[in-house]
Interface confidence: low
């Protein structure tokens, strides 16, 4: 067992708050001290006339767990004219994703409406706020002239984000074009230099982004997951989506290339609403130095021996033998109703056997639905199917299920004693928990 | 050939019957004076042969009572098994369907009210009488209700516009009564009148995206029995209308709706009061819910959507699915004929596990065919009996906790067959 | 943040029947259990009973079975604890309390004397 | 029920002083699921409501002086107080919430 959970350190956020919801590690070059960011996006903040407007808090990795909300945008809602809003901020979801890349943290609110400049409106095209140490710029790329559901009105741009080894940022919004979704990238170093607060639709030259096809293809949600990994073998990394709708609602997960969103690879579900492409992750688990794909489907139904179907949640492990070449196995839950794969998180070399190691989590699993984590060691054959560990959420809740295991991030060495450490997400008792590995 | 029974120096019982099925030990402590503790180990009929006293001898046994003096049941029998195994052993008993000549029938109309629909609701109003006609070929004392449905009433499903909140039917030109999750609004009667009152006062509703919140109402119309005015003795039908796919559980993530579906019933004043709350139920949690509440679903499906819903058919349980015509012309042909489908099938499901033991079990159905218990019989009539051959296997005796019993249900019907599990582990 | 207000002290004969009142603010009422507990002059603390706020369902430690009740009035975020047919050896101050690690919290405690 | 059994009753000490008292409770308070031992400490000053100092055995609950340590697993629990102060002077009450709630009958720091 790697992961201490004798002693975790648990953080706790404004009660209700989703406190939780996403979480990711953040390690500024201008400190020696690392940080957790744990998205909050019901929290209530200081801006004037928002409520539960959401936010991003630091939290400091060091005994005394203090959490600290980042300032990302202090402002209210900014007027079109006298007595009609441009945007609408309350309950617009900021801190439900939320990723850093050395000074960078990029944190999105997919709920956040807008009146559009056209006509007078409320669409969820979503924002985002990119902050690089000192400087902090909005980043909202459905924020466009491409109105109304059949452009990107409905896009909630930032419903899932990541960044790129080569700073890029890949956001997705499953909304765009009928619910088709879309996603986007864009360089950070062109995101800031082109900021301008009084230009609510900013063009972005070196823009890579998926377009509208045809009917057949609305409501599939591309954008409702996203990860990065090189699947061409150029070095630059790709883009991973999962589309859970896609396929007549069998999900599929689409790889785009990341120099030109040209399509690289498809994956497709086997059972329908199963929802195939919930999460995905991007890691060598099987050390050939290809990328290898993981997939959740939270609600596959497996059938049991007596013919019955009991949902017990799947992940799709796609090893990729040769550039573009995947061999898949699939690794099924072990409790009804518990969503196994609902997260996926590489863990790095946990064990420090050569193999990168991948957590996957069940949050409705184990006693009183509390949550599990699994953690899975990689080995040259591939992914062990039995976990190494089980880690056990501690919180029962009256009103919601603790969801513990719904966000989580590891491959990060917090305590720098030369093991990643994990950090998971239990927004429904509004908390996160950092297991540090030894 | 080889006694495994006799053959190791066993001076314990416990340790003697964990050598195998055929093993024994002998009770009486003095048996084969002067010998060593393993004489007293042996098969069974080698300890009566070298005569230890068959009273004497303790052994694994397996038993299977059905009582027949309290049955309640008068479809499926026995209404109540014990099995009697240890492990390695495996019982065997019949369990018996017999359908009703006529059922009593509840069938309530779950319609989509999105404005697509408006054309198909039309055909609504004039289904009452007609319909209560051709169903009294197949059924007894018949009864209908209604439900409207459209989705979850937040963004990014409807719009949240002041102007168009509460009615977001502009583009389609109709006047609108504001988009709502699920709501009741006919207890099941007899009264065909009231019926066609009822839904002759629905109004269209609209959103904006194109699947709906079907499983949302599906749900609540399966769990609220009070409600609904669900009667035991009746099949009970659940026809869904609908012209566009319905939203997964996880679809609500778009809208910030993150708790999953408590599978509880949660109307006040017959509004569906956690729609905007609560997840929609996975297809799972659906089926779970469905047959539990002995609900038969018939998809009435218009237009290219129609093949979703049959696809989706072999993940819910005891659903059929049909093709509703331009201006739902065939309706009530369609109710009749997915009626009767459903009376000519008998499907059985295993309603909980009992850890260490196997189920296995086989229909027999009235022509001769044996099939898994699952996919059970087709065209059945209502003078037919169908079997089920039920074999119990223990795999081990190692168990903590868990249930003791395990519940065989027919799908559809309103009585299960309880099989007791009774371990035999050790000696007495 | 999270608070409890009891109602205030009371003084009552024994025989009577006595309600004290526990208002909630700061948080989703229905989010924990609301618990009471006994402490009597100069004695130590006596859990006595827990209420889900949710369901409404009741639990009682033994020694408190019988003339104890507690209910809700969930509306204006509030509980209640009642004794009937109240006992000198009543005489103690209550709190109410929601037990959950991070949001602990108790009542200011109400105050009961019986005496004749 | 389980009964909660607290020593010594009371304890005089002077300020600075290293402070143990016991909790015994009677049957094992762990959960061999979640690796929690259900027992919390509360300090309760006169005239004051309790407040809780550690949860779970040993968790010292946000806000708590690092001075206040739990230790202990199973049916026996340890508070330390390791440099006594004169605000720590109240009586500490144990409590496990393994099966409904129990309380300890308490143990009282006084000034020597």
């Known amino acids: 067992f790697n992961l201490d959970v004798e002693s975790p350190a648990e953080y706790a956020g404004p009660e209700g708050s989703y406190f939780g919801f996403a979480v990711d590690f953040f390690e500024p070059s201008t400190s020696s001290r690392m940080f957790l960011l744990v998205g909050a996006p019901k929290a209530n903040t200081t801006q004037p006339g928002i409520v539960e407007g959401g936010q991003v808090l630091k939290c400091e990795c060091s005994s005394s767990r203090r959490c600290q909300p980042i300032e990302f945008d202090s402002t209210g809602n900014r007027d079109y004219a006298k007595d009609d809003p441009l945007e609408f901020k309350s309950h617009q979801w900021f801190g439900a994703s939320v990723r850093s890349k050395q000074d960078k943290i990029l944190a999105c609110a997919p709920l956040y409406h807008w009146r559009t400049e056209m006509k007078q409106e409320r669409e969820p095209v979503g924002t985002c706020f990119l902050q690089d140490g000192t400087k902090t710029v909005e980043y909202a790329p459905c924020r466009s002239k491409n109105i109304d559901a059949d452009g990107q009105g409905f896009c909630q741009g930032g419903f899932s984000i990541d960044f790129t080894k080569a700073d890029r940022v890949l956001l997705g919004g499953p909304g765009s074009f009928y619910w088709q979704g879309q996603l986007i990238s864009d360089q950070v170093a062109e995101i800031i230099s082109k900021y301008d607060p009084n230009v609510y639709s900013i063009k972005y030259n070196n823009q890579l982004a998926t377009r509208t096809a045809q009917a057949i293809f609305d409501d599939s949600y591309l954008g409702y997951s996203v990860a990065v990994g090189d699947f061409n073998g150029d070095g630059i990394e790709d883009f991973v989506s999962g589309v859970p709708r896609a396929a007549r609602t069998l999900g599929m997960v689409y790889i785009y290339d990341g120099k030109n969103m040209s399509s690289l690879h498809n994956f497709t579900g086997e059972q329908m609403a199963a929802y195939f492409g919930f999460s995905v992750a991007a890691t060598d688990i099987n050390g050939d130095d290809y990328a290898d794909v993981f997939i959740g489907a939270p609600l596959f139904m497996d059938r049991g021996s007596d013919g019955k179907l009991q949902e017990v949640g799947q992940v799709s492990v796609s090893l990729q033998r040769a550039v573009g070449d995947f061999q898949t196995t699939k690794l099924n839950g072990f409790e009804v109703f518990a969503r196994f794969g609902s997260a996926i998180a590489p863990l790095g070399d946990l064990d420090q056997d050569g193999f990168n190691d991948i957590a996957i989590a069940a949050p409705y699993g184990g006693e009183d639905k509390k949550g599990l984590v699994y953690i899975f060691n990689g080995r040259s054959t591939g992914l062990n199917s039995v976990p190494s560990q089980i880690l056990e959420g501690q919180w029962a809740a009256q009103s919601m299920p603790p969801s513990f295991g719904y966000s989580m991030k590891g491959a990060t060495d917090v305590d720098r004693n030369g093991y990643p450490d994990l950090v998971v997400g239990a927004f429904g008792v509004d908390r996160a928990v950092l297991y540090r590995a030894r | 050939e080889h006694n495994r029974c006799g053959s190791a120096n066993v001076v314990s019982c416990a340790r003697c019957l964990q050598l195998g099925p055929e093993c024994g030990w002998c009770v009486q402590e003095d048996f084969v004076s002067g010998g060593s503790g393993s004489e007293r180990c042996d098969t069974v009929s080698s300890l009566i042969s070298k005569g230890c006293p068959v009273d004497s001898i303790e052994y694994l046994s397996v038993h299977v009572v059905t009582s027949s003096e309290n049955e309640i049941n008068t479809q499926v029998t026995p209404g109540e098994v014990s099995v009697q195994l240890h492990p390695g052993a495996e019982a065997n008993f019949m369990l018996k369907v017999r359908p009703l000549k006529k059922y009593p029938v509840d069938l309530y109309y779950l319609v989509d009210v999105s404005a697509s629909m408006h054309n198909n609701i039309e055909k609504l109003n004039s289904v009452g009488n007609d319909l209560s006609k051709k169903m009294a070929l197949y059924s007894r004392d018949f009864r209908l209700g209604f439900g409207s449905y459209v989705d979850k009433t937040v963004s990014p499903y409807i719009s949240i516009h002041p102007e168009r909140i509460h009615n977001q039917c502009s583009d389609y030109n109709l006047d609108c009564m504001p988009p709502h999750g699920y709501i009741h609004v006919l207890s099941l009667t007899e009264n065909i009148t009231e019926f066609e009152k009822a839904v002759h006062r629905q109004k269209i509703s609209g959103n904006i995206d194109t699947p709906e919140g079907g499983f949302d109402a599906m749900l609540q119309a399966a769990v609220c029995e009070s409600h609904i005015g669900w009667r035991k003795e009746a099949k009970r039908l659940l026809l869904v209308m609908t012209d566009q796919t319905s939203h997964l559980a996880l679809d609500s993530k778009l809208a910030g709706i993150v708790v999953p579906n408590d599978g509880n019933c949660h109307l006040k004043n017959n509004v569906y009061v956690k729609s905007t709350t609560m997840e929609h139920p996975s297809l799972g949690q659906l089926s779970e819910k469905l047959i539990d509440n002995n609900i038969n679903v018939i998809f009435a499906v218009q237009g290219k959507q129609f093949h979703w819903y049959k696809d989706l058919l072999p993940l819910l349980p005891g659903a059929i699915a049909g093709e509703i015509e331009s201006k739902a012309a065939n309706l009530n042909n369609l109710v009749v004929e997915a009626y009767k489908k459903i009376i000519s099938e008998v499907k059985v499901q295993l309603e909980n596990q009992v850890h260490g033991v196997h189920f296995n079990i086989t229909a027999i159905c009235p022509d001769g065919a044996r099939k898994p218990g699952i996919s059970g019989c087709g065209n059945v009539t209502s003078n037919d009996e169908v079997l089920f051959n039920v074999t119990v296997v223990m795999k081990t005796c190692d168990i903590m906790g868990g249930k003791n019993y395990a519940i065989i249900k027919p799908i559809g019907f309103n009585e299960t067959t309880k099989v007791h599990i009774h371990r035999s582990c050790s000696c007495q | 943040q999270i608070q409890l207000l009891q109602s205030g002290p009371e003084l009552k004969k024994p025989g009577e029947t006595v309600k004290i009142s526990c208002k909630a603010s700061g948080y989703t009422f229905t989010d924990y259990s609301m618990h009471w507990v006994k402490q009597a002059p100069g004695k130590g603390l006596k859990w006595v009973a827990r209420i889900n706020t949710e369901t409404g369902e009741p639990t009682f430690a033994d020694d408190f079975r019988g003339r104890f009740a507690v209910s809700l009035e969930t509306s204006a975020s509030t509980a209640y604890l009642q004794i009937n047919n109240l006992k000198n050896e009543d005489t103690a101050t209550y709190f109410c309390?929601?037990?959950?690690?991070?949001?602990?919290?108790w009542g200011q405690g109400t105050t009961l004397t019986v005496s004749s | 029920d389980i009964v909660m059994t607290q020593s010594p009753s009371s304890l005089a000490v002077s300020a600075g002083e290293k402070v143990t008292m016991s909790c015994k409770s009677s049957q094992s308070l762990l959960n061999s699921r979640t690796r929690k031992n259900y027992l919390a400490w509360y300090q309760q000053k006169p005239g004051q409501s309790p407040r809780l100092l550690i949860y779970?055995?040993?968790t010292r609950e946000s806000g708590v002086p690092d001075r206040f340590t739990g230790s202990g697993s199973g049916t026996d629990f340890t508070l330390t107080i390791s440099s006594v102060q004169a605000e720590d002077l109240a009586v500490y009450y144990c409590?496990?919430?393994?099966?409904?709630?129990?309380f300890g009958a308490g143990t009282k720091l006084e000034l020597k």
């Open positions: 309390a929601i037990f959950y690690y991070g949001r602990d919290s």
């Open positions: 779970w055995a040993s």
């Open positions: 409590k496990q919430s393994y099966n409904l709630l129990s």
